[in-house]
Amino acid sequence: VPLDPISVSNSSSQIILKWKPPSDPNGNITHYLVFWERQAEDSELFELDYCLKGLKLPSRTWSPPFESEDSQKHNQSEYEDSAGECCSCPKTDSQILKELEESSFRKTFEDYLHNVVFVPRKTSSGTGAEDPRPSRKRRSLGDVGNVTVAVPTVAAFPNTSSTSVPTSPEEHRPFEKVVNKESLVISGLRHFTGYRIELQACNQDTPEERCSVAAYVSARTMPEAKADDIVGPVTHEIFENNVVHLMWQEPKEPNGLIVLYEVSYRRYGDEELHLCVSRKHFALERGCRLRGLSPGNYSVRIRATSLAGNGSWTEPTYFYVTDYLDVPSNIAK
């Protein structure tokens, strides 16, 4: 298994992956395989009303760049525990002995996985788009005896920003073949999106590829600067009872998802008032309604808040509310 995989993001569309070679490889490592897949945002984010008092916005940070080659790991492998900022204590004799036993067990277990669970797959020429793994068929565990084998699960890969659709192991996933180095820059990713990255070490290229159990690491790309800005005009409709319906388009490709909108409005000469519009509220009105407005000139600005923070305020929109009682209407019917 490749050791200490670290993933960081240096832009809104790239993740840099670094790792160390296996400590006890079975033969020579000829190449590594890196697979990645987009992770669905936690469904809880769609449920909560972030306009409720006391409810903090979810903390979703991207994976910051490396400080130095061997500095604190920002994103730990799923095999590792975060050690904080502290230095590790000197190892005792028993710890060293235990690690040697674990190393030996790991090597034996990998051999077992290769020989019993997996049929070696035919090599796949080319990189970047085709997942060669469908040709590696899983043997039935029925004839293996009483053994429990942990097989990595496939994370959700939604085709939209919400409903997650699990990908089957037979489905193609993007991957890259890495030769003669222990790092990879994964490009062409979606901004402010979590990715699950799978890394395998392989000790044979042709005719049959033999690869290790996967190490996993997660990372989130950086936010896109203007992705949370409301594009297009803020429109309004004034109804007879001094109700103003404001409408705007939601950002097309936000950073993660929009959790709320802030509406800031003021009557000329008065102080600014603020209104919070939740995802749920926006879904019904495609905007919001300002009720019981006093006659006068108004200006309104709106901004979206995503998982990455606030977008920019829109340019002010202006409207005039007349004195409702002075306007002849056919209300009394």
Partner: antibody, heavy 118, light 110 residues
Framework: QMQLVQSGAEVKKPGESLKISCKGS????????IGWVRQMPGKGLEWMGI????????RYSPSFQGQVTISADKSISTAYLQWSSLKVSDTAMYYC???????????WGQGTMVTVSS | SYVLTQPPSASGTPGQRVTISCSGS????????VTWYQQLPGAAPKLLIY???QRPSGVPDRFSGSRSGTSASLAISGLQSEDEADYFC???????????FGGGTQLTVL
């Protein structure tokens, strides 16, 4: 493409229970309200209720409150309309619709015909 | 009984202009957007006009909507045989906290 697909026609007896479904696809199901509308034979449209699948917030028309239950399972992008005890007067076509533009159903299911007779 | 009032029927000859009215009250049309739906025989309703006068993509510009006070109207110009359908107006109702519909207008192309 974006669509709502409803379950098939049902023929039931008075007093029986029933649950019909409406499955959304091609869009983010959790982010849009889904409504149920009744159309009795030869009649107009009547709003029954709406649900927000993101948190299952449900609002009923006073005429249907206590008569039906609206629910959703966001894990399978499906909304439901159910009766615990059907009446002959429940015979109608039932439509689900997605609210997208302000308060308007922009996508409709094909309808589920429910026939209740003894 | 339906909250919004529509004429039960309307008719016109091909090429003609037909208008369908819809009247409500201050709690619905008076303070909310009007929506129009078309329902062809044996089919599900289809969104025709939203936010009083907007057409979804794919709806011909022969269809237009307007709203004034507590009334609204749908106009169909250059009437065609395929326009023969039921037309329903709808609006959100603040007192009901949900949408209300008209009883529908059956349009016949003579």
């Amino acid at each position: 493409q974006m669509q709502l697909v409803q379950s098939g026609a049902e023929v039931k007896k008075p007093g029986e229970s029933l649950k019909i479904s409406c499955k959304g696809s091609g869009y983010s199901f959790t982010g849009y309200w889904i409504g149920w509308v009744r159309q009795m034979p030869g009649k107009g449209l009547e709003w029954m209720g709406i649900i927000y699948p993101g948190d299952s917030d449900t609002r009923y028309s006073p005429s249907f409150q206590g008569q039906v239950t609206i629910s959703a399972d966001k894990s399978i992008s499906t909304a439901y309309l159910q009766w615990s005890s059907l009446k002959v007067s429940d015979t109608a076509m039932y439509y689900c619709g997605r609210i997208s533009t302000p308060y308007a159903f922009d996508i409709w299911g094909q309808g589920t015909m429910v026939t209740v007779s003894s | 009984s339906y909250v919004l009032t529509q004429p039960p029927s309307a008719s016109g000859t091909p090429g003609q202009r037909v208008t369908i009215s819809c009247s409500g009250s201050n709690s619905n049309i008076g303070s909310n957007f009007v929506t129009w739906y078309q329902q062809l025989p044996g089919a599900a309703p289809k969104l025709l006009i939203y936010t009083n006068s907007q057409r979804p993509s794919g709806v011909p510009d022969r269809f237009s909507g307007s709203r004034s006070g507590t009334s609204a109207s749908l106009a169909i110009s250059g009437l065609q045989s395929e326009d023969e359908a039921d037309y329903f107006c709808a609006a959100w109702d603040d007192s009901l906290n949900g949408p209300v519909f008209g009883g529908g207008t059956q349009l016949t192309v003579l």
